[in-house]
Interface confidence: low
């Protein structure tokens, strides 16, 4: 028998520095977790102790903190090179800065193979990107070889900016011929490494003949056997075992997100490359693991530029940006309108001639807006200012909801109106009218939504049984502020870009902003 140790990360989302337990900014260092310096310590410890070790990443290193905003992927290549990753799969967020923003900082700089079998380049891009990413790579490990085949969510054109010259094929259809090719090369130990979410990971394990292990990402799935060491609740045991259509037991793993855990899977293969046994658990990278001093010193060196960046002017406002709780928790506020407009702008994807865009709606809990911005400081808006408005380090995500769920969400928005509670919704692409004289649960008297399948966008009444795409904070997608109906009834959820980054990019693009209160939210009775 031959034993392989697979160390894996996914959805690190720019958490190069250690973070607090909830993956936001580290405040009390003695209780902080993750970060590349700590990860390196643990990886090196395992490399020294065990003979056959692979360090893999299942995508979405890009996007999530000011590190990505400033360094644009150069930081990913640099520190992944320093940690000596063996392979990475492309995630949807790797395309956030377009194909050029993937090629230049990462694909050209990475010293490890970057993989995806279901992305096919066409047109002028085909020659430019040729060889910079691969469908698979055969890696020597000890005296053996292991094949790694990559895959990426086929939803990427709706989630990011891959442009028109990349085709995202069905994962299973694209993977099978690549695995077959590996078999003809006498590679009998094959890992599928990819970024399509836990459901697709399980399908790959079931359907793709010849795949021995699946290492996934995208859904931030936490798997654990035994008592979990932190706040994350396991979605199943680690590894999660899928019985393939040809009767094999295929381990499927994922390691939550944000570099908080290092996935640790030990696989035993027989001489024909069959999996005999698999066991392991994610390792919580808490403060009991010291940060490697040389990587930490490098992090500190790179940090300097971030501190300078956060005080640079992104753009100007010529109006007061009212982010006060007195406004945003009671009525339409122009800070809410600005943020929602930025959220929609960040999701402009012209992927179908029938639609002017794939999504037109935004909802945002008023309690998530934490500060106004005064225009009298020369109108200057900095990253620092935006960090005061959006201090929680969240993301703006894409969900699919039925109209009936949205109606419930808007009823919840005003079910206890008047108590300055955070669930009051700010909106974009929605016109809502409330009648507060009616009883809670029956206060939405008009709910019109901006069409997407139209050449001239206009507002139509919400249809209860129709499925709509909506951009919202991850906090709401996860049921925060009492929006349990969103969490329970959502039909699809894809994590998006860092909240501050979305707004800062929009402000930089617009240069001068002047958001108004314009009648998105109305009250049909009372003095509002």
């Amino acid at each position: 028998a031959w034993e392989l140790t697979i160390l894996h990360t996914n959805d690190v989302h720019s958490r190069l520095e250690q973070t607090s337990e909830d993956s936001s900014k580290c405040v009390n260092a003695s209780r902080c977790m993750g970060g590349v310096a700590r990860l390196f310590t643990k990886v090196q410890q395992i490399r020294r102790a065990e003979p056959n070790v692979l360090l893999l990443d299942a995508g979405d290193q890009y996007q999530g903190t000011i590190w990505f905003t400033v360094y644009k992927g150069a930081e990913v290549a640099h520190f992944m090179n320093a940690l000596r990753y063996d392979a990475m799969a492309l995630g949807n967020h790797e395309f956030d800065n377009g194909v050029e923003g993937l090629i230049e900082p990462l694909l050209k700089e990475a010293k490890f193979p970057i993989l995806s079998a279901n992305i096919k380049a066409k047109g002028p891009l085909a020659s430019q990107i040729s060889g910079l990413y691969l469908p698979y790579k055969v890696l020597p490990v000890g005296d053996e070889v292991v094949g790694i085949v990559g895959y990426t969510s086929k939803e990427t054109p709706f989630l990011s900016n891959p442009g028109t010259n990349l085709v995202f094929e069905d994962e299973i259809t694209a993977l099978q011929p690549e695995v077959d090719k590996l078999k003809t090369l006498n590679v009998n130990k094959i890992i599928a490494l990819g970024h399509s979410g836990f459901e697709m990971d399980k399908l790959i394990a079931q359907k793709v003949r010849g795949v021995d292990v699946v290492v996934g990402g995208h859904s931030n799935t936490f798997l654990y056997t035994g008592n979990p060491p932190s706040k994350e609740v396991p979605a199943g045991k680690y590894p999660f075992i899928v019985t393939s259509d040809d009767g094999r037991k295929v381990p499927v793993v994922q390691a939550y997100a944000f570099g908080k855990y290092l996935g640790y899977l030990k696989i035993e293969f027989d001489e024909r490359g069959n999996v005999i046994s698999s066991h392991g658990n994610p390792i919580l990278l808490n403060s009991s693991i010291p940060e490697d001093p040389s990587i930490k010193a490098d992090i500190n060196k790179w940090r300097i530029k971030l501190d300078n960046y956060s005080t640079q002017e992104l753009g100007k406002t010529i109006v007061y940006l009212d982010g006060s709780s007195q406004s945003c928790r009671f009525r339409e506020c122009n800070m809410g309108n600005l943020i929602c407009d930025a959220m929609i702008n960040n999701n402009l994807r012209h992927t179908d001639e029938m639609f002017w865009n794939h999504v037109s709606m935004c909802i945002l809990n008023g309690g998530g807006i934490r500060s106004p911005i005064d225009e009298r400081n020369n109108g200057t808006i900095t990253w620092e200012n935006l960090a005061a408005v959006l201090p929680f380090g969240g993301t703006f995500d894409l969900v699919q909801l039925k109209g009936s769920t949205l109606k419930k969400a808007f009823e919840h928005s005003v079910h206890r109106y008047g108590q300055s509670t955070g669930e009051f919704l700010q909106v974009g692409g929605i016109h809502v009218v409330y009648d507060l004289s009616r009883k809670p649960g029956d206060r939405v008297v008009k709910l019109d939504v901006l069409c997407t399948k139209c050449r001239v966008p206009s507002y139509d009444p919400l249809k209860m049984d129709e499925v709509y795409k909506v951009i919202l904070p991850n906090f709401l997608a996860n049921g925060g502020d009492g929006f349990q109906m969103i969490k329970d009834e959502l039909l699809r959820h894809d994590s998006g870009d860092q909240d501050i980054n979305v707004v800062s990019t929009y402000i930089s693009k617009m240069k001068v902003i002047y958001p108004a209160v314009e009648g998105r939210i109305k009250f049909s009775t009372g003095s509002h």
């Epitope: 640099h78 040389s294 530029k305």
Partner: antibody, heavy 119, light 106 residues
Framework: QVTLKESGPGILKPSQTLSLTCSFS??????????VGWIRQPSGKGLEWLAH???????YYNPSLKSQLTISKDTSRNQVFLRIASVDTADTATYYC???????????WGQGTLVTVSA | DIVMTQSQKFMSASVGDRVSVTCKAS??????VAWYQQKPGQSPKVLIY???YRYSGVPDRFTGSGSGTDFTLTINNVQSEDLAEYFC????????FGSGTKLEIK
């Protein structure tokens, strides 16, 4: 296409201040991520990096020369300037400006300007 | 500061030969190394960045390798126009250059 051109006094005396100008075209220091650096090369010798300025006015200097150096820019005129205070004969060199790529390697260089410090 | 040592000051080769120029960093610089070619009377031109990536338009007879502290620029099938001085440069810390290796063609 990207071009850079250095200009300087040609000759100056020890203890004077050397002022150099780099005029460039084909890119803008308004663009996020852009930067321009200065490198010098004494005749028949190796290259020495002096200073660098980013699009956002962030400045970096060679620590061993920091007290002598001042880098600045005029974004609207596509120019970067370097001042070296209190020069001496060891500062005789060809001075190049170059566009800094990604981290700190240089793809585009000017033709260089020869500066001689002589009593 | 990080010292980049090019121990060979001069190298000699005939057309068609293969030559290797080496460079050693005084500390780990990962793969943050570039190689430049400077022909007599000209400014330097980048050949390789990130230790092994050929800059666009550079002939494929130039290849770079190495990581950590030891780096090599290899010129396969040397041509007469390769007569030049070759410099390595690290950019892991503030940039520093090697002292250069002059290639002469026999």
């Amino acid at each position: 296409q990207v071009t850079l051109k250095e200009s300087g006094p040609g000759i100056l005396k020890p203890s004077q201040t050397l002022s150099l100008t780099c005029s460039f075209s084909g890119f803008s220091l308004n663009t996020s991520g852009m930067g321009v650096g200065w490198i010098r090369q004494p005749s028949g010798k190796g290259l020495e990096w002096l200073a660098h300025i980013w699009w956002d006015d962030d400045k970096y200097y060679n620590p061993s020369l920091k007290s002598q150096l001042t880098i600045s820019k005029d974004t609207s005129r596509n120019q970067v300037f370097l001042r070296i205070a209190s020069v001496d004969t060891a500062d005789t060199a060809t001075y190049y400006c170059a566009r800094r790529e990604r981290w700190a390697w240089f793809a585009y260089w000017g033709q260089g300007t020869l500066v001689t410090v002589s009593a | 500061d990080i010292v980049m040592t090019q121990s060979q000051k001069f190298m000699s080769a005939s057309v068609g030969d293969r030559v290797s120029v080496t460079c050693k960093a005084s500390q780990n610089v990962f793969t943050n190394v570039a190689w430049y070619q400077q022909k007599p009377g000209q400014s330097p031109k980048v050949l390789i960045y990130s230790a092994s990536y050929r800059y666009s338009g550079v002939p494929d007879r130039f290849t770079g390798s190495g990581s950590g502290t030891d780096f090599t620029l290899t010129i396969n099938n040397v041509q007469s126009e390769d007569l030049a001085e070759y410099f390595c440069q690290q950019y892991n810390s503030y940039p520093t250059f090697g002292s250069g290796t002059k290639l002469e063609i026999k």
